[in-house]
Interface confidence: low
C-alpha cells in the first residue's frame, strides 16, 4: 500500500493463515529505544525476505554507528537446519540474541548499559547456503541511554596573576545542569552548560577566579538525580587539595 510490500491471504484447511510471500527484503526496526544506564535494553529487529522456507546456513550481525561500515558488536551463526545461532562475537559479553533468526527475528538484548552505548545500531542477516543473499537495515534503531549525573572530574588549577580557577566536569543524560557554591558565591551559582565537542554527555562548568579560601562544591542535576563533589582551596599553604 504505502510502498512495494506485497501481502496476501491464503486459506488452508479453512484456517486463515496470514502469509506474506515477501517479494523483497525488508527490515522492521523502531526509530528509538530508551533505557537507563545500568539497565538492559531490547533492540527489536524483524525482517522479511524473498527466499521462502530458507533453511540453509545464516549469520546474524549487529553493528553500531553506521550501516555497512560500522564496527560489529554482535555476530552469531546458525548451521543448516539449526535454530540455534551460535554466538561468535558479543562485544564485552553484553550483547545476546533474543530473537530467532529462523523465524525472521534478530532482536538483540544489550546488558549493563553505559552512556557510551547511546548510538544507532543496525541489524543484518546473511544467507550462505544454496541461496547467497544478505540484507541490512539502513536507518537502524537509535538506542537512547539516560543516566543520572556523575561528576567525573573536579579540580583547582592555577591561572594567571597567581589566581586559581576551578573546573567541574559531569556526565549524564539529559546533560546535567551544573552549579557551584562556595565562599562569597552565595547558595548556588548556576553555570552555563557547555557540552564538550564530541562528548555529548559531558558538561563542564568553570569558576574563573577563586577569591576566598574554603570549600567549593559543584552540584550536577538532571531529571534523574543529582551528584555533588567538593574541592578545598588553601592559598596560605601555597597549594590546593581536592576531596570527592
Amino acid at each position: 500500500f504505502v510502498r512495494t510490500k506485497i501481502d496476501t491471504t491464503e486459506n488452508l484447511l479453512n484456517t486463515e493463515v496470514h502469509s506474506s510471500p515477501a517479494q523483497r527484503w525488508s527490515m522492521q526496526v523502531p526509530p528509538e529505544v530508551s533505557a537507563e544506564a545500568g539497565d538492559a535494553a531490547v533492540l527489536p529487529c524483524t525482517f522479511t525476505h524473498p527466499h521462502r522456507h530458507y533453511d540453509g546456513p545464516l549469520t546474524a550481525i549487529w553493528r553500531a554507528g553506521e550501516p555497512y561500515a560500522g564496527p560489529q558488536v554482535f555476530r552469531c551463526a546458525a548451521a543448516r537446519g539449526s535454530e540455534l545461532c551460535q554466538t561468535a562475537l558479543s562485544l564485552h559479553g553484553r550483547f545476546r540474541l533474543l530473537g530467532n533468526p529462523r523465524r525472521n527475528d534478530l532482536s538483540l538484548r544489550v546488558e549493563r548499559l553505559a552512556l557510551a552505548d547511546d548510538r544507532r545500531y543496525f541489524c543484518r542477516v546473511e544467507f550462505a547456503g544454496d541461496v547467497h543473499d544478505r540484507y541490512e537495515s539502513r536507518h537502524g534503531v537509535r538506542l537512547h541511554v539516560t543516566a543520572a549525573p556523575r561528576i567525573v572530574n573536579i579540580s583547582v588549577l592555577p591561572s594567571p596573576a597567581h589566581a586559581f580557577r576551578a573546573l567541574c566536569t559531569a556526565e549524564g543524560e539529559p546533560p546535567p545542569a551544573l552549579a557551584w557554591s562556595g565562599p562569597a558565591l552565595g547558595n548556588s551559582l548556576a553555570a552555563v552548560r557547555s557540552p564538550r565537542e564530541g562528548h555529548g554527555h559531558l558538561v563542564t562548568a568553570e569558576l574563573p577566579a577563586l577569591t576566598h579560601d574554603g570549600r567549593y562544591t559543584c552540584t550536577a542535576a538532571n531529571s534523574l538525580g543529582r551528584s555533588e563533589a567538593s574541592v578545598y582551596l588553601f592559598r596560605f599553604h601555597g597549594a590546593s587539595g581536592a576531596s570527592t
Epitope: 491471504t9 506474506s20 526509530p31 527489536p44 539502513r138
Partner: antibody, heavy 122, light 106 residues
Framework: QVQLKQSGAELVRPGTSVQMSCKAV????????IGWVKQRPGHGLEWVGD????????NNNEKFRGKATLTADTSSSTAYMQLRGLTSDDSAIYYC???????????????WGQGTSVTVSS | QIVLSQSPALLSASPGEKVTMTCRAS?????MYWYQQKPGSSPKPWIY???NLTSGVPARFSGSGSGTSYSLTISRVEAEDAATYFC?????????FGGGSKLEIR
C-alpha cells in the same frame, strides 16, 4: 486486503476499566507493529503506544503509563488495549493502526482501524 | 517531547487555488509525515518521509521542508481535498502529531 477491525463503542462509568480489541486480517500479524492513537475533539491525535506481536515488545507514551496496557494474541491476530481508572478525559475515539517501521526510516501508520469510541459517564 | 504546531488551523480555498499549510517542530526532526482525515473516518497516510506520496494520493499534493519547518502544498485544490491534515514526527519518543489544519472548499 489488509484490514484492522476494532471492537464496538463503549459507554463506561468513571473509575472502571475498558478493554478494546483490534483484529488484523490480510497480512502477517507478527511482522508488524500495532500502534494505538487517541483522538479527542479539539485535541488532535495522540500516540498512546505500540506493540510488536512477534516479539511482544512495547513502546509507551509516558503520559499513558499506568493508564494504558497493550497486549497481543498471535493465535487470533488480535491486539488489545486496556484503559483503567477511567475519567472524562479518557472519553475519545481510539484507533489502532499498523505501523510500518521500514528499513529506510520511512515509518508510517499505513492501515488504520475504524476506531473504538469510549464514553466515560456516570 | 517534540511539539508540532500547524498553521493555519483553518483555511478556506476555492477549487483551482494553490494551498500551503505548515508544520513547525519545537526541535529539529529528520522527516515529517502527513495524514488526511475526513469527518467520520479514520486518518489516512498521505505523505511519508517529508516528500513521498503514499499510493493513491494525487500528484497535486507535495511535501517539503527540513529541520523545524515543513509544509504540505496542494497545487490546485479540488473539492475532494476538503479534510483535516495532521503532521507527525517519528524522530523522538513520544511520537507526536500536530493539532491539524482543516481545509474547507468554498
Amino acid at each position: 486486503q489488509v484490514q484492522l477491525k476494532q471492537s464496538g463503542a463503549e459507554l463506561v462509568r468513571p473509575g472502571t476499566s475498558v478493554q478494546m480489541s483490534c483484529k488484523a486480517v490480510g497480512y502477517t500479524f507478527t511482522n508488524y507493529w500495532i500502534g494505538w492513537v487517541k483522538q479527542r475533539p479539539g485535541h488532535g491525535l495522540e500516540w498512546v503506544g505500540d506493540i510488536h506481536p512477534g516479539i511482544n515488545y512495547t513502546n509507551n507514551n509516558e503520559k499513558f503509563r499506568g493508564k494504558a496496557t497493550l497486549t497481543a494474541d498471535t493465535s487470533s491476530s488480535t491486539a488489545y488495549m486496556q484503559l483503567r481508572g477511567l475519567t472524562s478525559d479518557d472519553s475519545a475515539i481510539y484507533y489502532c493502526a499498523r505501523v510500518d517501521y521500514d528499513y529506510d526510516g520511512s515509518y508510517i501508520m499505513d492501515y488504520w482501524g475504524q476506531g473504538t469510541s469510549v464514553t466515560v459517564s456516570s | 517531547q517534540i511539539v508540532l504546531s500547524q498553521s493555519p488551523a483553518l483555511l478556506s480555498a476555492s477549487p483551482g487555488e494553490k494551498v500551503t499549510m505548515t508544520c513547525r517542530a519545537s526541535s529539529s526532526v529528520s522527516y515529517m509525515y502527513w495524514y488526511q482525515q475526513k469527518p467520520g473516518s479514520s486518518p489516512k497516510p498521505w505523505i511519508y518521509a517529508t516528500s513521498n506520496l503514499t499510493s493513491g494520493v494525487p500528484a497535486r499534493f507535495s511535501g517539503s521542508g527540513s529541520g523545524t519547518s515543513y509544509s504540505l502544498t496542494i497545487s490546485r485544490v479540488e473539492a475532494e481535498d476538503a479534510a483535516t491534515y495532521f503532521c507527525q514526527q517519528w524522530n523522538s519518543k513520544p511520537w507526536t502529531f500536530g493539532g491539524g489544519s482543516k481545509l474547507e472548499i468554498r
